[in-house]
């Protein structure tokens, strides 16, 4: 919807356009008005833009009008949330941003005979975006001044420059999305796609084989399994195998059949043959045994002479018995085949907690450190095996040993280095010890046996320029005296970095200090106060260009100030009544020299140049193959020589073309087979061979026997705004902007209230290229000085 | 800021039902994350046990599959753990932990942890 | 199941030196999305554990920068640059490509 506001009405002699008085007569003495005031009501008439307003035709945006909202003169910005003076036009199409307004300012006249009579009209053509900003608009010209607001706003749900992109946040089975400010749709987490209703898959699941309804699901589609449903199920009842795809068996090494369960290696699996038969897999599952002389039976595991086989181990004699065979054993074994060693361990017969270890028909003991002999009855001698490390002397006791330990050492095997440190070191300090004794590794900045010392920093005078040296830990600090600084004090003392002085004044270091050197405009320690010339000395108006005051920096000792209201491009000429004009430089004009004339007016650049206006002088950009000032001289393409061969040249624009002789071809004729080559064809072309010449297919933005030649196509409608000059660049364009536009295409109003132009707490008002001043009261000019 | 905290007996016999019970705070367990129970036997290392999505979508580890069940009670916010025939190996401290579907982090939030011994 | 193997079980380090933990797989850890699917976590004395590093070499956040993963395929390393008072504890490896996810025996870093 479209809103405007009233702010504010002055008609202070309450008179209506045509000149007469809204309550009637007028007062013979001074001409004033008398009776009764204006009964103030607007009219609104929203319209498409028109460049040269016209005051009828139809309101083809929407009109209305407010009530009697006041009389002559009245004031409503403080009245917030009083509907009486807005008014709303709803509108169902999408904003066009541009439009034509027309207030009217009525007076009412209460009566049905008499007809209301119009006050003031204001028209208003312009660009608004939607917003929640209200753009503040004031008529100021004939007998009424008045002020208002307007603003447009997107319904809920609507937004862009036209209000018709349309986006309403929705978590449901048709979306989960929220909306950003520019109407986009931004999905909710776990949610993708234009509309927000496609799941994200758990991190990792198969996009072919696995699916998922809800986010961070993964669901294995008939055939798939595992974690991310890509590992596919093999045949029910595969045994030794695996799949590709689903309900494959595909049999591993030496296993087959349909469901890869049977052994083709019977043989190598499981070794059936025994006493040396020798295996053959004959089938699935299947094998067969020879076996060696002597034995018999599917395994071979039949003997047909019971001791041909050797059964009885360990040195046991074998004799055969109707029943098979049977063993007589050597000393120290038993058992049917003598394979049982006899245990000589029971009972044990070793003293003193030694260990039996049983051997074939005997026993060894395996005696702890202190004891000896066959069954552990002797004391061992330990000083043998010199287990004392540090020690004077080793005596033999019964099962044990004793020790002498040298000083600083104890233990058993006085291999115990004795802790000597106690505490003694002192400030923090790490005590290392040492075989009867310890050393003191003291901190930063301490030293003595104990560290108890600490040591002087300051004794080797470090402080320079008089600094005083402060003796500390580990460190020592200078205390500087005025001037300087620096650990140090090594640095002379720079006031000036950063310079304090301002508005451009000059700083001069001293000892302790900085003093500066102020332009004649301003005053005080920094420079940073305008100097107020009316204090001192008053201002004379000379002219409505030139004021005068007394100065002692010139030999007359008076200083003319002119006017900048002509800006920085034209000088002021005062007129009579007050009045002046500006005399503009070269390339400018208007009213205050703020506009550059448009050199490209009479087209000066030819065979489809582009014209860029500078001030007071013109640039032309060539199409591509021309050059010189106005892009009147081809190119000469042949400048090179490109044609090979003994091939003639003949110039075109921008490209050439080669004659070419004895059966060369190609663009250069620098082939025998082909017409083209990666060169042939410019701009990413594609080139085509067809017999006695090419042919170029070019891509968009480009045309020419070989793509040399940019269309037009790109700034055509030209995109540039405000009359930015568009400049063809392939497929693509850029806009050289006129003053005061700015962006990729001149669509930014350049902001010339850019660096602060008024002074004294003047508002600035950015224009189309101009700014004006409003200045705080007590202040005028037109930059408020 | 997420937070999981497990609850259950700390003592179940021999051939008893092992049961424990998760509550979530600071997360819906109907998000887009899976909800694992992962336990350490006194001195050992980790065990991952299983996990359920949304309530109806479960895997278990094979060493555990014919005795484990894994649950959810979305109006509670809570993970449930069943584990049946428990014997002395399944004495352990037990822990309920976060498994996001969606991001790169795996096993980015974790409960204190409850201990079980199984004895008569 | 892929069996993770972790190199040393324990570990013994002055603050301020550097520490390395290795972690083989019995399979490659690489998905077919180009992740690999490696993890490495911290569990502290009488605490849960918790994530440090995500597939390989990624920080999980609050992780100080002195942790760093690598590797690739089936062997992987946790380096700690200057290792701190409080990271003691046991450390893990995992793996999130297959059931059942399994994970490292663990090396137990102890300051000297």
């Known amino acids: 919807q479209f809103e405007l506001e009233i702010l504010s009405m002055q008609n202070v002699n309450g008179e209506l356009q045509n000149g007469n008085c809204c309550g009637g007569a007028r007062n013979p003495g001074d001409r004033k008005c008398t009776r009764d005031e204006c009964d103030t009501y607007f009219k609104v008439c929203l319209k498409e833009y028109q460049s040269r307003v016209t005051a009828g035709g139809p309101c083809s945006f929407g009109s209305g009008s407010t009530p009697v909202i006041g009389g002559n003169t009245f004031n409503l910005k403080a009245s917030r949330g009083n509907d009486r003076n807005r008014i709303v036009l709803p509108f169902s199409f999408a904003w066009p941003r541009s439009y034509t307004l027309l207030v009217e300012a009525w007076d009412s006249s209460n009566d049905t005979v008499q007809p209301d009579s119009i006050i003031e009209k204001a028209s208003h053509s312009g660009m608004i975006n939607p917003s929640r900003q209200w753009q503040t608009l004031k008529q100021n010209t004939g007998v009424a001044h008045f002020e208002y607001q307007i603003r447009v706003t997107c319904d809920d749900y609507y937004y862009g420059f036209g209000c018709n992109k349309f986006c309403r946040p929705r978590d449901d089975f048709f979306g989960h999305y929220a909306c950003d400010q520019n109407g986009n749709k931004t999905c909710m987490e776990g949610w993708m796609g234009p509309e927000c209703n496609r799941a994200i898959c758990r991190q990792g699941c198969s996009p072919k084989h696995g699916s998922c309804k809800l986010p961070g699901d993964c669901r294995c589609q008939y055939g798939w399994q595992g974690l991310y449903c890509d590992k596919c199920i093999p045949h029910p009842g595969c045994v030794h195998g695996i799949c590709n795809e689903p309900w494959q068996c595909l049999c591993e090494t030496n296993w087959g059949g349909q469901l890869c369960d049977k052994d083709l290696n019977y043989c190598g699996t499981h070794q059936p043959c025994l006493n040396g038969g020798t295996c053959s897999n004959t089938g699935p599952d299947k094998y067969q045994c020879s076996c060696p002389e002597g034995y018999s039976g599917p395994n071979c595991e039949i003997a047909e002479h019971a001791c041909l086989s050797d059964p009885c181990h360990n040195r046991g004699s074998c004799k055969e018995t109707s029943l098979g065979f049977e063993c007589e054993c050597s000393p120290g074994w038993t058992g049917p085949t003598c394979s049982t060693n006899i245990d000589d361990c029971s009972p044990n017969n070793c003293s003193h907690g030694g260990t039996c270890q049983d051997l074939v028909n005997g026993f060894k003991c395996v005696c702890p450190p202190q004891w000896t002999g066959k069954t552990c009855q002797l004391d061992a001698n330990e000083c043998e095996a010199k287990p004392c490390v540090n020690a004077k002397s080793c005596k033999n006791l019964i099962a044990s040993y004793y020790c002498d330990c040298l000083p600083g050492w104890m233990g058993q095997n006085c291999d115990i280095n004795i802790n000597d440190c106690l505490g003694q070191c002192q400030n923090d300090a790490s005590c290392r010890d040492l075989v009867n004794g310890y050393r003191c590794i003291c901190p930063p900045g301490y030293a003595g046996d104990h560290c108890e010392r600490d040591i002087d920093e300051c004794a080797s005078n470090p402080c320079l320029n008089g600094g005083h040296c402060q003796n500390e830990i580990n460190r020592f600090q200078c205390l500087c005296p005025t001037g300087f600084s620096g650990n140090l004090c090594q640095l002379d003392i720079d006031y000036c970095e950063p310079n304090p002085c301002q508005n451009g004044a000059q700083c001069y270091n001293r000892a302790s200090d900085y003093f500066c050197k102020c332009p004649e405009d301003y005053e005080g320690k920094n420079c940073s106060h305008l100097k107020d010339h009316c204090r001192t000395t008053p201002c004379e108006v000379i002219d409505s260009c030139t004021v005068a005051m007394a100065s002692n920096d010139t030999p007359e000792g008076v200083r003319y100030i002119s006017s900048n209201v002509c800006g920085p491009h034209g000088k002021c000429k005062s007129q009579s009544g007050g009045k002046f004009t500006c005399d503009c430089n070269k390339g400018f004009t208007g009213t205050y020299c703020h506009e550059n004339i448009n050199d490209c007016e009479s087209n000066p650049c030819r065979n489809g140049g582009t014209c860029i206006d500078g001030v007071n002088s013109y640039k032309c950009i060539c199409s591509d193959g021309w050059e010189g000032a106005y892009c009147e001289t081809n190119i000469n393409d042949c400048s090179q020589n490109p044609c090979h061969n003994g091939g003639t040249c003949r110039d075109l624009v921008n490209d050439f073309y080669c004659d070419c002789k004895n059966g060369w071809k190609g663009k250069t004729c620098h082939s025998r087979d082909s017409q083209c080559d990666e060169a042939t064809c410019n701009n990413g072309g594609t080139c085509y061979d067809e017999g006695d010449a090419f042919k170029c297919m070019c891509p968009g933005g480009w045309e020419g026997t070989t793509c040399n030649i940019a269309r037009n196509s790109s700034c055509l409608p030209n995109p540039c705004h405000n009359g930015g000059t568009c400049v063809v660049n392939g497929e693509s364009f850029t806009c050289v902007c006129k003053e005061g536009w700015e962006g990729p295409i001149c669509a930014q109003n350049t902001n010339d209230c850019s660096p602060h132009p008024c002074y004294n707490s003047g508002t600035c008002v950015d224009g189309d290229n101009w700014y004006r001043c409003e200045c705080a009261p007590g202040f005028a000019g037109p930059d408020c000085r | 800021q997420v937070q999981l905290q497990e609850s259950g007996p700390g003592l179940v016999k021999p051939s008893g039902t092992l049961s424990l019970t998760c509550t979530v705070s600071g997360d819906s367990i109907s998000s887009s994350n899976w909800w694992s129970w992962v336990r350490q036997p006194p001195g050992q290392g980790l065990e991952w046990i299983g996990e359920i999505f949304h309530g109806e979508n479960t895997n278990y580890n094979p060493s555990l599959k014919s005795r484990v069940t894994i649950s959810v009670d979305k109006s509670k916010n809570q993970i449930s753990l069943n584990l049946t025939s428990a014997t002395a190996a399944d004495t352990a401290v037990y822990y309920c932990?976060?498994?996001?579907?969606?991001?790169?982090?795996?096993?980015?939030?974790w409960g204190q942890g409850t201990l079980v011994t199984v004895s008569s | 199941d892929i069996v993770m193997t972790q190199t040393p079980l324990s570990l013994s380090v002055t603050p301020g030196q550097p520490a390395s933990i290795s972690c083989k797989s019995s399979q490659s850890l690489l998905h077919s999305d180009g992740k690999t699917y490696l993890y490495w976590y911290l569990q502290k004395p009488g605490q849960p554990p918790q994530l440090l590093i995500y597939e390989v070499s990624n920080r999980f956040s609050g992780v100080p920068d002195r942790f760093s993963g690598s590797g690739s395929g089936t062997d992987f390393t946790l380096k700690i640059s200057r290792v701190e008072a409080e990271d003691v504890g046991v450390y893990y490896c995992?793996?999130?490509?297959?059931?059942?996810?399994?994970f490292g025996q663990g090396t137990k870093l102890e300051i000297k």
């Open positions: 995992m793996q999130h490509i297959d059931f059942p996810f399994t």
């Open positions: 932990a976060r498994n996001p579907g969606i991001g790169a982090a795996k096993f980015d939030s």
